[in-house]
Amino acid sequence: MSLWQPLVLVLLVLGCCFAAPRQRQSTLVLFPGDLRTNLTDRQLAEEYLYRYGYTRVAEMRGESKSLGPALLLLQKQLSLPETGELDSATLKAMRTPRCGVPDLGRFQTFEGDLKWHHHNITYWIQNYSEDLPRAVIDDAFARAFALWSAVTPLTFTRVYSRDADIVIQFGVAEHGDGYPFDGKDGLLAHAFPPGPGIQGDAHFDDDELWSLGKGVVVPTRFGNADGAACHFPFIFEGRSYSACTTDGRSDGLPWCSTTANYDTDDRFGFCPSERLYTQDGNADGKPCQFPFIFQGQSYSACTTDGRSDGYRWCATTANYDRDKLFGFCPTRADSTVMGGNSAGELCVFPFTFLGKEYSTCTSEGRGDGRLWCATTSNFDSDKKWGFCPDQGYSLFLVAAHEFGHALGLDHSSVPEALMYPMYRFTEGPPLHKDDVNGIRHLYGPRPEPEPRPPTTTTPQPTAPPTVCPTGPPTVHPSERPTAGPTGPPSAGPTGPPTAGPSTATTVPLSPVDDACNVNIFDAIAEIGNQLYLFKDGKYWRFSEGRGSRPQGPFLIADKWPALPRKLDSVFEERLSKKLFFFSGRQVWVYTGASVLGPRRLDKLGLGADVAQVTGALRSGRGKMLLFSGRRLWRFDVKAQMVDPRSASEVDRMFPGVPLDTHDVFQYREKAYFCQDRFYWRVSSRSELNQVDQVGYVTYDILQCPED
């Protein structure tokens, strides 16, 4: 799609024919439906200069008008060589995906002085992109806001109404503001400066592929990778795969490696597939049954027949006409094509192209190196194709940039700055000194010397939005596919050995022994009415109260001699006063001074794929929720067994918490999910679990001083 909306009409659609082979190794093919523009460089420059504020009126067209002064302005603003010419560096910049906010001037004249006059900023996520799981989107936005709150006095609170200061919306084309998006690439997002109504709002082009900057995010199920996302591309049997594959399996289930190399790392999971589960419908998430009969016809794949909305569905029994049971087929982000002449269809592997078979996306036949696939099994006869998903754009980075605008920042001319208009993927710290100086010019620095994450008090929505689809129920273990592409992986380490004998020694005091200097605790638990914090063989006790400080450190070995130095999680069962200590694949249960264990997690009904228990929450009388990575189970304390049918995914029960928490604990009737030095606090009201605060464990729970 063209970067410049007014030029949509001059796109050239190429016919369905092959080009004469060029004198080079691979044949170049003209793909039907491939959109190319016949824009001259000058036309492109005129549109760009006007759209982004370098020329005042759209009529500044025609060869007679010199673009020199405007080009100089642009080159100065974007820190390009100031030639005043339409040179290759300038053209390259003009073709780079970017923010839609003009560099000079604004969308329009706004009222007010374009900063917020209160520091507790609220935001509402009005809708979602389907490119990423909702929890990942929530997290990306929370982290983007946290960048700005870390360097200013601002806090960011998620709310559930359009009364929010900042409304976040995914939209396509004309999406309700008079500044239409332009299809894939080009213009990625835009935001308005602070103020009422549309002012302060941030809009993201949903024709982009939103990711975390490194390819589509495909969460896996089962396998041995604990729900980790696919890693694209990955190596399997020496070949590179850029999408989920059924290679190496006889059951047709698509899978992927969750690391770059399956051959060396052996980590994998199953990709969303209608052969694994369906969504919504009326069949309780059961997988598709192929073939199935619908209106007397046989179907061996998901279909949109019988529906006007284009949703793919299938029957979950052999005969829909008789049983009327169906579900919707999960979307396969890894192999849903974009552009071409089959947008939205799935790649079909293997497919035949120029007589050769391909079981992964290819750039053969193209001169631009872009990966593509056929959407039927034979491109040569059907000519149906589309582009394979690319790296996508980091929602976190683009959001952080747009939120800068929503707080009142203009574009920066420093190429390394977050507020530079062009998209640039980086895994380093996003904020540049220029960004920090700009935002502090508006709001001043944080009163505390130490940066802190946002406080996100989440008020109850007046009517909770329907989350559709909420996702299928977890597949019962007996229905699970076999463990891996080439058989079950060998069992991982059984966990650390128990600590050797120890004598009761006083711990020599050093700065490390102050709980306030501990960055990340191994485990935290409420025992009795105190909070216990464990780290490297030591623990502290903390009682809430004005001016109270954590007491300790004490040696774990003095109080619980059987335990190892490193704990993953701890909890107290209130009725029996039993203490459960988890480390690796082992658990110890203390009742007073007597200990049972170490016992393997298998004894609790947790399979070999559960490497550790990362936390626990109370869940009714004598019941707990046990967490491991992205999964959780219901645990009967008396029976000391998990209910295998209760397995669920954390982000379904606790939307908005990070996906990679290392500790989950309960304190004062609220749930805390720890990631790095931060916690996400969840309160449960009328059966809705909602993040109501994000903070530092040390400053906000332990009340540590911030100097």
Epitope: F107, Q108, F110, V167, D177, Y179, P196, P464, T466
Partner: antibody, heavy 115, light 107 residues
């Protein structure tokens, strides 16, 4: 508080043009889009068009050739102009503020097309 | 243009009853549906926006749900003052379009 008020001619002869002014208070046209909607007697609501904060417009495709919407931000006024009126253009014409739904409406101005 | 279809032109109900009005979009409009109430001789009033969010000051007996193409507006316990015509509207893509309306009659 937020208010919108339409003022129009009431009676228009067939083939003539219609001009309605929507005067707003309590909010800025720089922060909210304004939509026009009409309702023929005893019938449903028909969306006519919108003018967004920056002045761009979108129209009902069936009426696009006859419709024009403009505004004067400083006077807080939005204008609807419609050409070549016929009897089936008889309706109550409303302007409404938009922000994820039309949250404030004018009381409407009744337009009768008759000779 | 997207067509919004309200299958029932009229619905009859009694005070205290639960009533649901449905609206179907001719193509996916995500969650961008609003519901309006219009009483005789009055301008329409926004009740629900973005499919499921109640507008400020709207009683909690009014709820909305749905996403994609199928949307439902529900009054959990009908009151006499709920006698009105209810319209759905999509604001996903211009031209924005309304459903034909459902007139709620109280027995």
């Amino acid at each position: 508080q937020v208010q919108l008020k339409e003022s129009g001619p009431g009676l228009v002869a067939p083939s003539q043009s219609l001009s309605i002014t929507c005067t707003v208070s309590g909010f800025s046209l720089l922060s909210y889009g304004v939509h026009w909607v009409r309702q023929p007697p005893g019938k449903g609501l028909e969306w006519l068009g919108v003018i967004w904060t920056g002045g761009t417009t979108n129209y009902n495709s069936a009426l696009m050739s006859r419709l024009s919407i403009s505004k004067d931000d400083s006077k807080s006024q939005v204008f609807l102009k419609m050409n070549s009126l016929q009897t089936d253009d008889t309706a109550i014409y409303y302007c409404a503020r938009y922000y994820y739904g039309m949250d404030y409406w004018g009381q409407g101005t009744s337009v009768t097309v008759s000779s | 243009d997207i067509v919004m279809t309200q299958s029932h032109k009229f619905m009859s109900t009694s005070v205290g009853d639960r009533v649901s009005i449905t609206c179907k979009a001719s193509q996916d409009v995500r969650n961008t549906v609003a519901w309006y109430q219009q009483k005789t001789g009055q301008s329409p009033k926004l009740l629900i926006y973005s499919s499921s969010y109640r507008n400020t000051g709207v009683p909690d007996r009014f709820t909305g749900s749905g996403s994609g193409t199928d949307f439902t507006f529900t009054i959990s316990s009908v009151q006499a003052e709920d006698l009105a015509v209810y319209f759905c509207q999509q604001h996903y893509i211009t031209p924005y379009t309304f459903g034909g309306g459902t007139k709620l009659e109280i027995k």
